[in-house]
Amino acid sequence: CKAMHVAQPAVVLASSRGIASFVCEYASPGKATEVRVTVLRQADSQVTEVCAATYMMGNELTFLDDSICTGTSSGNQVNLTIQGLRAMDTGLYICKVELMYPPPYYLGIGNGTQIYVIDPEPCPDSDF
């Protein structure tokens, strides 16, 4: 019996508008009906929560209204989008998957996605 595996891309480049998207996929060892997905940012040895959402299998993924994340789910795959990123937010973003219900609980953690954010160059002033 192998432990739950979580896969995510190694590297993602954010768009010029500070939006980064990546897929988090997990191989479930059980028949979960309730799943929690958390995005964590690891900088040095500090780990902080970026956003989290719990969803019922077959239903949509819903983050809190003030969250910088949005996402959609399809089976054991979650499409995550993080918005409002700036160059200082460049770092390793880890996808954590928890099978919450029914028991037993299972934990799975991806290796992390290195998100690179480049602040856009300010537009030069133009005279008309």
């Epitope: 019996c1 309730e34 929690r36 880890i94 037993p104 934990l107």
Partner: antibody, heavy 119, light 107 residues
Framework: QVQLVESGGGVVQPGRSLRLSCAAS????????MHWVRQAPGKGLEWVAV????????HYADSVKGRFTISRDNSKNTLYLQMNSLRAEDTAVYYC????????????WGQGTLVAVSS | DIQMTQSPSSLSASVGDRVTITCRAS??????LNWYQQKPGKAPKLLIY???SLQSGVPSRFSGSGSGTDFTLTISSLQPEDFATYYC?????????FGPGTKVDIK
């Protein structure tokens, strides 16, 4: 700094009830799974129960299922363990512990509170 | 449920000795394995998390290795303050089981 302080232990007769509390401070309480772990005199560590985040999901050891209830009040940063139908084998030091945000290890423990079930 | 076993259950060693404790899970737990040290009358203290990561403030003589089902805690040079009981624990799936412990005492 992170602090966990248990209270509510004491001597109780078999079949009676007791409620333990764990006051947490120094971190965003609602972002963490919170656990109870116990240790009978001269014995090893035994995981008792966990309650996740918003309190909707809870899991228990078979030895306490149906008798113990774990709960939390995120507005008060407090964890609880309601222990009913207590037995002599529930005699132990009870610790609350914070599960790490990433891999769930117990980086922070309370000092423990002793529950003695005796007639 | 995942069962955790530890060996040896106790050992006697001298200051300066290299000590190795093994922990085995009844099924794969990836790297979700933690090691704790406990002294009489005290709460357990985290030493190693995620199989091989040293907890902040823990001396570098402690190290952990392994993944899947087999794990090891090594103390490279035993110090007087290291005489204690050591527990492994899995944080992969409920119930979050502990090993039975290994008591390290003075030879």
């Amino acid at each position: 700094q992170v602090q966990l302080v248990e209270s509510g232990g004491g001597v109780v007769q078999p079949g009676r009830s007791l409620r333990l509390s764990c006051a947490a401070s120094g971190f965003t309480f609602s972002s963490y799974g919170m656990h109870w772990v116990r240790q009978a005199p001269g014995k090893g560590l035994e995981w008792v129960a966990v309650i996740w985040y918003d309190g909707n999901n809870k899991h228990y050891a078979d030895s306490v299922k149906g008798r113990f209830t774990i709960s939390r009040d995120n507005s008060k940063n407090t964890l609880y363990l309601q222990m009913n139908s207590l037995r002599a084998e529930d005699t132990a030091v009870y610790y609350c512990a914070r599960g790490d945000i990433l891999t769930g290890y117990y980086g922070y423990w309370g000092q423990g509170t002793l529950v003695a079930v005796s007639s | 449920d995942i069962q955790m076993t530890q060996s040896p259950s106790s050992l006697s060693a001298s200051v300066g000795d290299r000590v190795t404790i093994t922990c085995r899970a009844s099924q794969s737990i990836s790297s979700y394995l933690n090691w704790y040290q406990q002294k009489p009358g005290k709460a357990p203290k985290l030493l190693i998390y995620a199989a091989s990561s040293l907890q902040s403030g823990v001396p570098s003589r402690f190290s952990g290795s392994g993944s899947g089902t087999d794990f090891t805690l090594t103390i490279s040079s035993l110090q007087p303050e290291d005489f204690a009981t050591y527990y492994c624990q899995q944080s992969y799936s409920t119930p979050f089981t502990f090993g039975p412990g290994t008591k390290v005492d003075i030879k």
